[in-house]
């Protein structure tokens, strides 16, 4: 019997979207509307995901396949599988406590979510400010300013060649 | 609301294959089981086997050697083969809807079924 | 497999009457997968109890069943004439599926 191919495990032979059904000698039965089973074998089927509220579904349950949720426009997907959704802020903002606040002055943040970062420091490198920083930018670092002294080329050097052996593969 | 239709050749000869196709209309044929049951003339409902969307297979031991069923999901059909038929495989042919649970755990038994298409096998 | 035995293979009554319909299993059947269907000529069997006690969508108040383990019955309280017909006793608790020979409900 198909049921029994596995004489250790009659349940292997049930497919995903079923349960090895319990309560009727080990049968495979279809699962319940609103769940499913993503591997062959299972005892139980899983309770499909709900996207409710800030929650949107970007793809159906099926018997064999969880739903999978998005966020509603703004708000972004947080964590493993979009566990949660977080509000969106303009670029310049951050997500505070009390909602969405401007970038300190000194900081930035070009995207809709995350925290606002320092802007670059470009004297680090030896390098000088090239464009200010904004609360939406950061800073562009150019040329050192011994760079910029008289007489000194604006002009880039070639890049060296490349040793034999160590071209790109 | 979910409908069968069985279609297939009315007559067979002996020692060929008798091949019937369900389709199924009003609903998806996805998440279920579907099975075949047959009806001499005359006769009691015989159990042939059953088969899921995956393509999963029950049949009834009595015809397990002779029987191969398959579902092809995209045009929403499942289907019966039954090779080296003898007049005692004329009946009458029926598709139907496996038993199946609600999100309650309640079970629903074979709901929905074919209006059945005869088969005679006949040189 | 589990052999359902029916009884009585025919039942002569008289519209009006009550009909009682026995299904014996061979082996103990959980009453959830317990099913009656019945069947008029040349139509398709239509399923009018399942669970051994619920019936089915649109199946009238005077067909009822009940049962557990081995034994199980339909019951049609006052025949009307549309329930002259054959009634099967089906069981899909354990593979195969097994149906009873039927009983033959006719008009005395």
């Known amino acids: 019997f198909e049921r029994t191919r596995s004489l250790q495990d009659p349940c292997s032979n049930c497919p995903a979207g079923t349960f090895c059904d319990n309560n009727r000698n080990q049968i495979c039965s279809p699962c319940p509307p609103n769940s499913f089973s993503s591997a062959g074998g299972q005892r139980t089927c899983d309770i499909c995901r709900q996207c409710k509220g800030v929650f949107r579904t970007r793809k159906e349950c099926s018997s064999t396949s969880n739903a999978e949720c998005d966020c509603t426009p703004g708000f972004h997907c947080l964590g493993a599988g979009c566990s949660m959704c977080e509000q969106d802020c303009k670029q310049g903002q951050e997500l505070t406590k009390k909602g969405c606040k401007d970038c300190c002055f000194g900081t930035f943040n070009d995207q809709k979510r995350g925290i606002c970062r320092p802007w670059t420091n470009c004297s680090l490198d030896g390098k000088s400010v090239l464009v200010n920083g904004t609360k939406e930018r950061d800073v562009v670092c150019g040329p050192s300013p011994a760079d910029l002294s008289p007489g000194a080329s604006s002009v880039t050097p070639p890049a060296p060649a490349r040793e034999p052996g160590h071209s790109p593969q | 609301q979910v409908q069968l239709q069985e279609s297939g050749p009315g007559l067979v000869k002996p020692s060929e294959t008798l091949s019937l196709t369900c389709t199924v209309s009003?609903?998806?044929?996805?998440?279920?089981?579907w099975s075949w049951i047959r009806q001499p003339p005359g006769k009691g409902l015989e159990w042939i086997g059953r088969?899921?969307?995956?393509?999963?297979?029950n049949y009834n031991p009595s015809l397990k050697s002779r029987v191969t069923m398959s579902v092809d999901t995209s045009k929403n059909q499942f289907s019966l083969k039954l090779s080296s038929v003898t007049a005692a495989d004329t009946a009458v042919y029926y598709c139907?809807?496996?038993?199946?649970?609600?999100?309650?755990?309640?079970?629903?038994?074979?709901?929905?079924w074919g209006q059945g298409t005869t088969v005679t096998v006949s040189s | 497999e589990i052999v359902m035995t029916q009884s009585p293979a025919t039942l002569s009554l008289s519209p009006g009457e009550r009909a009682t319909l026995s299904c014996r299993a061979s082996?103990?059947?959980?009453?959830?997968?317990l099913s009656w269907f019945q069947q008029k000529p040349g139509q398709a069997p239509r399923l009018l109890i399942y669970?051994?006690?619920t019936r089915a969508t649109g199946i009238p108040a005077r067909f009822s069943g009940s049962g557990s383990g081995t034994d199980f019955t339909l019951t049609i309280s006052s025949l009307q004439p549309e329930d002259f017909a054959v009634y099967y006793c089906?069981?899909?608790?354990?593979?195969?599926?097994?149906f009873g020979q039927g009983t033959k409900v006719e008009i005395k």
């Open positions: 139907a809807r496996d038993g199946w649970y609600d999100e309650d755990y309640n079970y629903y038994g074979m709901d929905v």
């Open positions: 009003g609903g998806s044929i996805s998440s279920y089981y």
């Open positions: 088969i899921y969307t995956s393509g999963s297979t």
């Open positions: 082996q103990s059947v959980s009453s959830n997968y």
């Open positions: 669970g051994a006690s």
């Open positions: 089906q069981q899909d608790y354990d593979l195969p599926w097994t």
